[in-house]
Interface confidence: low
């Protein structure tokens, strides 16, 4: 099981389009967050493609990786696993039409509040939110 602080809210698919499409704005922040500690080129390619799918002015939240080493690895694994499940949902919906529950595929829990930048966000960083 993923640690409590590692549980992320990842809304995979949009429910307002037919067929449902990848909810790029919800997924992108997580890939941007794991980008530094993942393979540079592969993650960049995924981000690039997700960027193309995103509507121009859709809002995007900033997410961070946890500072703890174990939690960080779990976090990255969770994101990749969820993204894989997202893609499966997309393929299924394309093949068989939308299924109940697939439109809002997510892992319950709260998003991680730490800043995107900095491995130890409690040390010298401070933040201010733009709404």
């Amino acid at each position: 099981m993923v640690p409590e602080s590692n549980r992320t809210l990842l809304l995979c698919l949009t429910s307002d389009s037919q067929p449902p499409r990848l909810n790029s704005s919800a997924i992108l922040p997580y890939f941007r967050a794991i980008r530094p500690l993942s393979d540079k080129n592969i993650i960049d390619k995924i981000i690039e493609q997700l960027d193309k799918l995103k509507f121009q002015h859709e809002p995007e939240t900033e997410i961070s990786v946890p500072a703890d080493t174990f939690e960080c690895k779990s976090f990255i694994l969770t994101i990749l696993q969820q993204f894989s499940a997202c893609l499966e949902s997309v393929f299924k919906s394309l093949n068989s039409g939308p299924q109940k529950g697939e439109l809002n595929s997510k892992l319950e829990g709260k998003p991680i509040p730490n800043p995107l930048l900095g491995l130890d966000s409690t040390r010298t960083g401070h933040h201010h939110h733009h709404h």
Partner: antibody
């Protein structure tokens, strides 16, 4: 081609203020964290400030915190550094730097020179 | 703050030979199995240029004669075979924790 062009460097008196700008082009500016790094006259490099890609998070070393403010305008592809209460030890070449994720600085501008002297 | 000590402060290497630059950190700069140590090259009158990121990854466009290794507190930049254009000052930098810090630099001269 990634380009970072700094401007605003000048000669300023101790206690004075200055605002540096960095115009970015050749990449999706809003996708990247950005930093300011300075190089002192004795050629030592010092990290000055970092801002997250959306501008929500800012970071400073203790000797800078409270005096300098990093900010960005993603619509204008521009990074800023507002410097106040300047000291002679702030004399340096200031570089605008693109961040790869949060841990790597992969492209540096040509720099803008700041001299603090009476 | 994490102190980075580079050695030697300067070195002269014959064309085609190997240059080895060391960077020692006052505490571990590894995170999640990755050394968060980076190497930059700066030629006179120019801005620094990223060569190696996260201890051993060669930045795009950087010649393969440059390589990085190390973990925790000890890191090394290797240049082999050294070429004329490699004459520059080399800096290490850690991003394991804030404040990010740099080594004092190593000036490489080609004989």
């Amino acid at each position: 081609e990634v380009q970072l062009v700094e401007s605003g460097g000048d000669l300023v008196k101790p206690g004075g203020s200055l605002k540096l700008s960095c115009a970015a082009s050749g990449f999706s500016f809003s996708n990247y964290g950005m930093s300011w790094v300075r190089q002192t006259p004795d050629k030592r490099l010092e990290w000055v400030a970092t801002i997250s890609y959306g501008g929500s998070y800012t970071y400073y070393p203790d000797n800078i915190k409270g005096r300098f403010t990093i900010s960005r305008d993603n619509a204008k592809n521009t990074l800023y550094l507002q410097m106040s209460s300047l000291k002679s030890e702030d004399t340096a070449m200031y570089y605008c730097v693109r961040g790869y994720g949060y841990d790597t600085m992969d492209y540096w501008g040509q720099g803008t020179s700041v001299t603090v002297s009476s | 703050d994490i102190l980075l000590t580079q050695s030697p402060a300067s070195l002269a290497v014959s064309l085609g030979q190997r240059a080895i630059i060391s960077c020692k950190a006052s505490q571990s700069v590894s995170f999640a199995g990755t050394g968060l140590m980076h190497w930059y090259q700066q030629k006179p009158g120019q801005q620094p240029k990223l060569l190696i990121y996260r201890a051993s990854n060669l930045e795009a466009g950087v010649p393969t004669r440059f390589s990085g290794s190390g973990s925790r507190t000890d890191f090394t930049l290797n240049i082999h075979p050294v070429e004329e254009e490699d004459a520059a000052t080399y800096f290490c930098q850690q991003s394991r924790e804030y404040p990010w810090t740099f080594g004092g630099g190593t000036k490489l001269e080609i004989k």
